[in-house]
């Protein structure tokens, strides 16, 4: 599923991401926008021989399993086909644990590059939320 | 642009021990990123060793390494570490520092480890 703009800070509102571990709203969609551009079944396969998953762009040699890349800690407990759904949760849920993890958004590079330090608010902007 | 120099292979016999090192510059070492290492023996694929990512400290490793090999990284000294121990003769391979940063990864060009029997 490709999400629109407010329809992904609605989505990730009732989940409990707006202000989570201190980050607004507009951070998470910015950052799924430059991860995937809103698709929920972005993937993308690193040199390294792992993969990053889903909206958020999730690694499987950290936090999922996809059964192909060696060394996979699966942090989050949950196949990587998961983080594919159209449903959000588990990839909600499992970023929930990496923002938790002590470096904040600055997990996601696309975050640190795109959106940190930008007017993030501009993200959520006319979205009746 | 990064630039990784690994050094610290050579020759050892089984049941040794080697540290390997891997120097970046060019580039701050973000804290962020996953760095680690992988090795390629004579006529074989490239395969992962072991990688840690965060200050937190998480640390993983290819089943055939685990509880031999511990990786490390000093940020302020822009290095990460790979102490090998109890060394086995397929441990012999060149051995590949790592980083990746996005979808972009930096390679360095490796260090010869030799494992006698």
């Known amino acids: 599923k490709v999400f629109g703009r407010c329809e992904l800070a609605a989505a990730m509102k009732r989940h409990g991401l707006d202000n989570y571990r201190g980050y607004s709203l507009g951070n998470w969609v910015c950052a799924a926008k430059f991860e995937s551009n809103f698709n929920t079944q972005a993937t993308n396969r690193n040199t390294d021989g792992s993969t990053d998953y889903g909206i958020l762009q999730i690694n499987s040699r950290w936090w999922c399993n996809d059964g192909r890349t060696p060394g996979s800690r699966n942090l989050c407990n949950i196949p990587c086909s998961a983080l594919l759904s159209s449903d959000i949760t588990a990839s909600v849920n499992c970023a929930k644990k990496i923002v938790s993890d002590g470096n904040g958004m600055n997990a996601w590079v696309a975050w640190r590059n795109r959106c940190k330090g930008t007017d993030v608010q501009a993200w959520i902007r006319g979205c009746r939320l | 642009q990064v630039q990784l120099v690994e050094s610290g292979g050579g020759l050892v016999q089984a049941g040794g021990s080697l540290r390997l090192s891997c120097a970046a510059s060019g580039r701050i070492f973000s804290i962020y990123d996953t760095i680690g290492w992988f090795r390629q023996a004579p006529g074989k694929e490239r395969e992962f060793v072991a990688a840690t990512i965060t200050t937190a400290g998480i640390t993983t490793y290819d089943d055939s390494v685990k509880g031999r090999f511990t990786i490390s990284r000093d940020n302020a000294k822009n290095t990460v570490y790979l102490q090998m121990n109890s060394l086995k003769p397929e441990d012999t391979a060149v051995y590949y520092c790592?980083?990746?940063?996005?979808?972009?990864?930096?390679w360095g060009q490796g260090t010869q480890v030799t494992v006698s029997s």
């Open positions: 790592y980083v990746r940063v996005g979808r972009g990864d930096y």
